[in-house]
């Protein structure tokens, strides 16, 4: 509550997160023209990235374009991209939706469709839907440990969210254990009124708000965090504004002296830890 | 404007960025002793990195040191680094400018020059100038979509910069479309009074400031962002303080059972999105 | 000091860091069943990562699990993980401490011990102690250049911590050179009352606080940073809350057409640069 006689100071904060969990992924794998069911295990080194500070990312879905090489090829025949003659293809043109630079030639993509030839990483990425259900949908059961160190320099006061009395095998619960700082990802979504399974397909951004309302007067001292959760991306966003959360990254390698890459379009949840609050003292 | 009767609260913010664009890079490539012109295509997975939060990086230039191996070799003969006898080389010494640890021997670097031998990734990186013009100078035409979700927890008010009425094919313009959140990189520089082509050579840091001055009283409600741009690195910085913006990263691989790496010195623009402002309510 | 007649405004800040230094690492290397002493050099591309903004990470120690393949194998026999029969192993079970998914079979780990078989990256990571002393303990002598640009938008005032008069070969010292923004990592720890050699083993988080107390009135103008240092992780933390600072990342490669990875558990110091303060003007 507002104590008008107090000198208030905003919080200075540092956050450290640690994700735990393993996912088993089952997907169709094509090798030598034969498609079969492949099983693989993803651990933290596979689904998360070494990230600093107030954010962490958990990959929940992906689309791979394997064995890409820099060369010429027909671009992917997305809506409005087909051609019937070279006139439709403009040498040097880079369509923002395309993945390469046009050569000016209209060439066969397959039996029935022709598209503009591009200089690109080939074959160009197919614009296919993210797999549904999400490949790492079991990430719902992953947990994250959040360590938060705070400081009010003007009051020369420092504390943290994890106290020596806490139990390292706890799981946060709004009612039963509101001070535990180990969170099940699925619970975070439930608290925010969101469906993890649904969001995992396209990805999204989830806010974990840590609010410190600290009374630093010795006679009524109180300084503990309050956790709340809210979705930060717009689930009703128009296609043109890129709904969900994804990014592309590549693994480069050489094969028979040819530089190749595997392109991964990674969908997932970015968790932003938003720390705010004040410390007041007479 | 300052309404002194209002209770003001700082903004809590979350940012998500998405860069689009393709660059065609032409550079001299040496293979088997023969140098020829090589063309390559860079897409987002090649020139940007999966980054969290309030920053994104676009590589605009680079210098590669290919096929480095951990062994002994003469260090690069930069100014003041040449020697004429072993006396000038101190076993175990690490010159902060050097790339290795001296063995204590003075050895030939080429026909005319001798330098101290070092234990390092060899051959050591040549201290050559960044290519001019910048290899990815066409990044000027890339665009970035910025999504910003803000929250005033004390007023229990949330909004975002992208409204349902917005058009996903817009481009920000200070006068004609000041609420569009898709920015052409070249325009950002122009607005900040900077020359993209010039900065792209050595790299730099550009600030995109998003100012929310929100009046949350129902009778005069207003809460929209105002965008402004300013360069954050010091263009007049002394050499010793590392002007521009660059970092080194490595791609590791094995060849004939020997651990090798390609070292990339990446120059580019780091864009920092600085969100600030207040929400006031009676 | 508090000037009550002044209009105060919080600082908007952007940070850029540059680490310098080389480490020589000596460790036991096993090849073809023969163990010998291996020496290697680590430079910035090897021990740090391209990171944005207000954090940088310096790897000081590591544990490698080389040549892992996705297959079935016995899990590591950590405390409480051994079994004597299949009854102890639950098909499909993922123990949060384990690195895989149990198949339901109890199999020999070595001559004397049996553990539950798992589907995982095999052989699973051994839960061995971080090397002591730390492999990159010489990181104590690395230096970091910190560039900080600040802005008080309401007062339309911008400045930075590096002035044109500064000397690029300085090193920060609390008394002799408190405005130099090149810091020796070991000095940062000393200032914070911490032992670098000790923290380097398990890793930790170190705060570099930059405090700007700016009087922007022309008649008594003052706006320079004050640096202070404090450890942000809890050195007395219970095992269950993951003391120190580490993360795992992987290098993926193909060998004889088999997808493999080297898992690196990287321990190190994350430095958080915490910029705060106010600008006041009549």
């Amino acid at each position: 509550s507002d104590k008008l006689y107090q000198r208030k100071e905003p919080v200075i904060s540092s956050v450290h997160t640690k994700v735990k969990g393993i996912a088993e992924v089952t997907e169709n794998v094509t090798e030598g023209g034969v498609t079969k069911l492949g099983h693989s295990i993803f651990d933290t080194a596979d689904y998360t990235f070494p990230l600093q500070g107030n954010s962490f990312f958990v990959m929940t879905n992906y689309v791979k374009s394997e064995g890409q090489v820099q060369t010429l090829c027909p671009e992917y025949p997305r809506r409005g991209a087909q051609c019937s003659s070279d006139r439709r293809c403009k040498k040097g043109w880079m369509d923002p939706q395309s993945k390469g630079i046009q050569t000016g030639r209209c060439v066969p993509y397959d039996k029935t469709r022709k598209t503009c030839e591009v200089s690109a990483w080939c074959p160009t990425e197919e614009e296919k839907e993210a797999p549904r259900p999400a490949l790492l949908r079991s990430a719902e059961n992953f947990t994250v440990l959040i360590k938060n160190n705070i400081h009010f320099p003007g009051h020369n006061y420092t504390t943290r969210n994890i106290l020596p009395t806490m139990n390292g095998s706890c799981t946060f619960h709004k009612t039963w254990d509101p001070q535990c700082s180990i969170f099940r990802l699925g619970d975070i979504f439930q608290e925010a009124g969101e469906n993890f399974t649904e969001v995992a397909v396209q990805g999204g951004i989830m806010g974990i708000e840590i609010y410190w309302d600290c009374n630093l007067d010795s006679w009524s001292h109180h300084c503990r965090p309050r956790y709340s959760f809210r979705r930060l991306d717009d689930k009703n966003m128009d296609e043109s504004f890129v709904p969900g959360y994804n990014f592309r990254y590549a693994k480069y390698y050489k094969e028979n002296n040819v530089e190749k890459r595997t392109l991964i379009k990674a969908f997932g949840i970015r968790f932003d830890i938003l720390v705010f609050g004040t410390g007041g003292k007479f | 404007s300052d309404k002194l009767y209002q209770r003001k609260e700082p903004v809590i913010s979350s940012v998500h960025t998405k860069v689009k664009g393709i660059a065609e890079v032409t550079e001299n490539v040496t293979e088997g002793g023969v140098t020829k012109l090589g063309h390559s295509i860079f897409d987002t997975a090649d020139y940007t990195f999966p980054l969290q939060g309030n920053s994104f990086f676009v590589m605009t230039n680079y210098v590669k040191s290919e096929g480095q191996v951990q062994t002994l070799c003469p260090e690069y003969p930069r100014r003041g680094a040449q020697c004429s006898s072993d006396r000038r080389c101190k076993k175990g010494w690490m010159d902060p400018q050097s790339k290795g640890i001296q063995t204590g021997r003075c050895v030939p670097y080429d026909k005319t020059r001798k330098t101290c031998e070092v234990s390092a990734w060899c051959p050591t990186e040549e201290e050559k100038e960044a290519p001019r013009p910048a290899l990815l100078r066409s990044a000027e035409n890339f665009t970035v979509l910025i999504k910003n979700n803000i929250h005033f927890p004390g007023h229990n008010y949330t909004t975002r910069n992208i409204l349902p009425t917005m058009n996903g094919s817009c481009t920000f313009h200070k006068t004609w479309d000041p609420q569009c959140s898709i920015f052409r990189l070249g325009d950002i520089f122009q607005e900040a009074g900077e020359n993209f082509t010039e900065v792209a050579v050595q790299g730099g840091i550009m600030g995109i400031e998003i100012y929310w001055d929100c009046n949350l009283d129902s009778w005069s409600h207003h809460c929209r962002p105002r965008y402004s741009f300013r360069r954050l690195d010091d263009k007049n910085m002394d050499e010793s303080f590392v002007p521009g913006y660059n970092f080194r990263y490595a791609k590791y691989y094995k060849e004939n059972n020997v651990e090798k790496r390609t070292l990339i010195k990446a120059f580019g623009i780091r864009f920092d999105i600085l969100v600030f402002g207040t929400g006031g309510k009676f | 000091s508090d000037k009550l007649y002044q209009r105060k405004e919080p600082v908007i800040s952007s940070v850029h860091t540059k680490v310098k230094g080389i480490a020589e690492v000596t460790e036991n290397v096993t090849e073809g069943g023969v163990t010998k002493l291996g020496h290697s050099i680590f430079d910035t591309a090897d021990y740090t990562f391209p990171l944005q903004g207000n954090s940088f990470f310096v790897m000081t120690n590591y544990v490698k699990s080389e040549g892992q393949v996705q297959t079935l194998c016995p899990e590591y026999p950590r405390r409480g993980a051994q079994c004597s029969s299949d009854r102890r192993c639950k098909k499909g079970w993922m123990d949060p401490q384990s690195k895989g998914i149990q198949t339901g079979r109890c199999v020999p780990y070595d001559k004397t011990r049996k553990t539950c078989e798992v589907s995982a990256w095999c052989p699973t990571e051994e839960e061995k102690e971080a090397p002591r002393p730390a492999l990159l303990r010489s990181a104590e002598n690395f230096t970091v250049l910190i560039k900080n640009n600040i802005h008080f938008p309401g007062h339309n005032y911008t400045t930075r911590n590096i002035l044109p008069t500064m000397n690029g070969s300085c090193t920060f010292h609390k008394t002799w050179d408190p405005q130099c923004s090149i810091f020796r990592l070991g000095d940062i720890f000393q200032e914070a009352g911490e032992n670098f050699t000790e923290v380097a083993v398990q890793g930790g988080i170190m705060g570099i606080e930059i405090y700007w107390d700016c009087n922007l009135d022309s008649w008594s103008h003052h706006c320079r940073p004050r640096y202070s240092f404090r450890r942000l992780d809890d050195k007395n933390m219970d095992e269950s809350f993951v003391p120190g600072y580490n993360f795992r990342y992987a290098k993926y490669y193909k060998e004889n057409n088999v997808e493999k990875r080297t898992l690196i558990k990287a321990f190190g110091i994350r430095f958080d640069i915490l910029v705060f303060g106010t600008g006041g003007k009549f």
Partner: nanobody
Framework: EVQLVESGGGLVQAGGSLRLSCAAS?????MGWFRQAPGKEREFVAG????????RYADSVKGRFTISRDNAKNTVSLQMSGLKPEDTAIYYC???????????RGQGTQVTVSS
């Protein structure tokens, strides 16, 4: 699925020439040739994009083999000269989406080079 039929294989003396041909059942962006010698892995020989742009050759055949295409007929030919015993293999025609990427291949035609 694309059907491919190769022809033109046979026995030839070292230093001699041979021309292989391949007809595809439908148009395709790239057409090329692979070969497999007994006990060895299948290897790429030559490839051609639409209208013969771009072309790509394995280092071992550069300057000796020439690939050519007829888009109208959906055919590709491989003119082989200066043949060596190590060129002995089954030669397969293939089609794909770039000169590096091939999805379909034919049954193959035997080429034997005697010394």
């Amino acid at each position: 699925e694309v059907q491919l039929v190769e022809s033109g294989g046979g026995l030839v003396q070292a230093g001699g020439s041979l021309r292989l041909s391949c007809a595809a059942s439908e148009r395709t962006y790239s057409m090329g040739w692979f070969r497999q010698a007994p006990g060895k892995e299948r290897e790429f020989v030559a490839g051609s994009g639409w209208d013969g742009i771009p072309t790509r050759y394995a280092d071992s055949v550069k300057g000796r083999f020439t690939i050519s295409r007829d888009n109208a007929k959906n055919t590709v030919s491989l003119q082989m000269s200066g043949l060596k015993p190590e060129d002995t293999a089954i030669y397969y025609c293939a089609t794909g989406t770039s000169v590096y990427h091939y999805q379909y291949r034919g049954q193959g035609t035997q080429v034997t080079v005697s010394s």
